[in-house]
Interface confidence: low
């Protein structure tokens, strides 16, 4: 008996070959020996099967000798033994229509699982085996799950059914719906403007959801919420923002907000949460801001950063083309007397400089000029 | 749409604990902090602290080392825990969905807590 | 810790009175001040944030002002649904506190 693997809405050919390369009488029934279709002449007759409407041959092969059943729109339920009598012979076929879907939706959020579930005719026991798009394997029985979602699954899954030694391959287009970064850092000088850009990792025609930036500032003891928003079809509105700082966003995605002056008391920590319509959960991205500030006081030369700096940062001090002062892993280094010229703070991380100050000490009877 | 919903009155005796729960719906609980504000019987409001989206608490002096807030997001609720009660802590104990700046916006309906002997 | 200083108490105004009720911070806190409205048995509803910016829903008839120690909230025509008690509350640091109310009664 041969074996044919079909997919769950999907179309097959049965095939059926007579000796004679004329057109003759044949019939294909099912294993209740309902008549399925056949031939009276040259026209294509239908029996009282549940396949009537999606049962179809090919008028044009007929001549050939070939009289293939063609199923449309499978059906886990069309497995069956079909069989095709032609010049007083039989032909067996053995269908097994599989289907493979995704738990309720395939745009799912980063962290979220992944449920696959195989439906399989009964009495079938068929293997499942899985390609992640970034080509990560999983193997599975009637469900396969993948939890904890990453930007790199989103794409196709290709899924092969294993029955009878043949395959039939799914595939499924995968969405997570995430930020494109996890985290991101800001290093600014005192005073300048921040810009914070939240890219989505994913595309879709409608995006509908509510936002909140929560900000926890290294000098305050609890968080606070910056600003909450909406967004219809792309489109940004600010429902609330706090008065100090006072964000402005953007009106159109990326999400991007704008702090209008990086200040010691506002660099910190913060969590972008987007909630969108119709999905439980919330898309998070978190975002730092380090900020810079050298001053002169008397005597003392200072350099100072804010926020959270890895302890393997460097800080530093130096006179212009000069070696440093004062390098510390640090977060505060100071110069005492210093001499007059344009000196430079810098926020450097294995040698590459993230963050730079100039500060001019004039001779010690002026005062100093931050440039 | 925000809601908190609280749980039933309590009687308790003087030197007893209470543990008062805060359920919220309708929104994303993990995003935002919760104040717990009382309101003794013909008083005005009193603050006694905020647990912020993290876990985190801040408590009032005044309730340090008697209260203890801890949120459980699996179902979505808070709780508010007051310990060694006297007489003075009958009050109406509310929650309410704290957002810094912008206040408090959206209140639990209350939970009367009796001390007496 | 921060005080907050309503005054009146209370007061008796009659529907259609214009109403002012002012709350004092012991010290500067710029705009971080909160208004509530408050009826017997219920919990408080926000009203004004920000020191003037109106809630979502609360009619147009009350309006905050003030910045630093000084605020005010105003009723412009007193409706008979605005019969309770108004507290402020300032966000400014913690812990956060509130004024003692202001309970305004019909005249």
């Known amino acids: 008996k041969k074996v044919v693997l079909g997919k769950k809405g999907d179309t097959v050919e049965l095939t059926c070959t007579a000796s004679q390369k004329k057109s003759i009488q044949f019939h294909w029934k099912n294993s209740n020996q309902i008549k399925i279709l056949g031939n009276q002449g040259s026209f294509l007759t239908k029996g009282p099967s549940k396949l009537n409407d999606r049962a179809d041959s090919r008028r044009s092969l007929w001549d050939q000798g070939n009289f293939p059943l063609i199923i449309k729109n499978l059906k886990i339920e069309d497995s069956d033994t079909y069989i095709c009598e032609v010049e007083d012979q039989k032909e067996e076929v053995q269908l097994l229509v599989f289907g493979l879907t995704a738990n309720s939706d395939t745009h799912l959020l980063q962290g979220q699982s992944l449920t696959l579930t195989l439906e399989s005719p009964p009495g079938s026991s068929p293997s499942v085996q899985c390609r992640s798009p970034r080509g990560k394997n999983i193997q599975g029985g009637k469900t396969l799950s993948v939890s904890q979602l990453e930007l790199q699954d989103s794409g196709t899954w290709t899924c092969t059914v294993l029955q009878n030694q043949k395959k039939v391959e799914f595939k499924i287009d995968i969405v997570v719906l995430a930020f494109q970064k996890a985290s991101s850092i800001v290093y600014k000088k005192e005073g300048e403007q921040v810009e914070f850009s939240f890219p989505l990792a994913f595309t879709v025609e409608k995006l509908t959801g509510s936002g909140e930036l929560w900000w926890q500032a290294e000098r305050a003891s609890s968080s606070k919420s910056w600003i909450t928003f909406d967004l219809k079809n792309k489109e940004v509105s600010v429902k609330r923002v706090t008065q100090d700082p006072k964000l402005q966003m953007g009106k159109k995605l990326p999400l991007h907000l704008t702090l209008p002056q990086a200040l010691p008391q506002y660099a910190g920590s913060g969590n972008l949460t987007l909630a969108l319509e119709a999905k439980t959960g919330k898309l998070h991205q978190e975002v730092n801001l380090v900020v810079m500030r050298a001053t002169q006081l008397q005597k003392n030369l200072t350099c100072e950063v804010w926020g959270p700096t890895s302890p393997k940062l460097m800080l530093s001090l130096k006179l212009e083309n000069k070696e440093a002062k004062v390098s510390k892993r640090e977060k505060a280094v100071w110069v005492l007397n210093p001499e007059a010229g344009m000196w430079q703070c810098l926020l450097s991380d294995s040698g590459q400089v993230l963050l730079e100050s100039n500060i001019k000490v004039l001779p010690t009877w002026s005062t100093p000029v931050q440039p | 749409q925000v809601q908190l919903v609280q749980s039933g009155a309590e009687v308790k005796k003087p030197g007893a604990s209470v543990k008062v729960s805060c359920k919220a719906s309708?929104?994303?609980?993990?995003?935002?902090?919760l104040s717990w504000v009382r309101q003794a019987p013909g008083q005005g409001l009193e603050w006694m602290g905020i647990i912020n989206p993290s876990g985190g608490t801040n408590y009032a002096q005044k309730f340090q080392g008697r209260v203890t807030m801890t949120r459980d997001t699996s179902t979505s609720t808070v709780y508010m825990e007051l310990s060694s009660l006297r007489s003075e802590d009958t009050a109406v104990y509310y929650c309410?969905?704290?957002?810094?700046?912008?206040?408090?916006?959206?209140w639990g309906q209350g939970t009367l807590v009796t001390v007496s002997s | 810790d921060i005080q907050m200083t309503q005054s009146p108490s209370s007061l008796s105004a009659s529907v259609g009175d214009r109403v002012t009720i002012t709350c004092r911070a012991s010290q500067d806190i710029s705009n971080y001040l909160n208004w509530y409205q408050q009826k017997p048995g219920k919990a408080p509803k926000l009203l004004i944030y920000?020191?003037?910016n109106l809630e979502t829903g609360v009619p147009s008839r009350f309006s905050g002002s003030g910045s630093g120690t000084d605020f005010t909230l105003t009723i412009s025509s007193l409706q008979p649904e605005d019969f309770a008690t108004y507290y402020c509350?300032?966000?400014?640091?913690?812990?956060?506190?509130f004024g003692q109310g202001t309970k305004v009664e019909i005249k």
């Open positions: 309708g929104g994303t609980f993990s995003s935002y902090a």
């Open positions: 309410a969905r704290d957002l810094g700046d912008p206040g408090m916006d959206v």
């Open positions: 509350q300032q966000s400014y640091s913690t812990p956060l506190t």
């Open positions: 920000d020191a003037s």
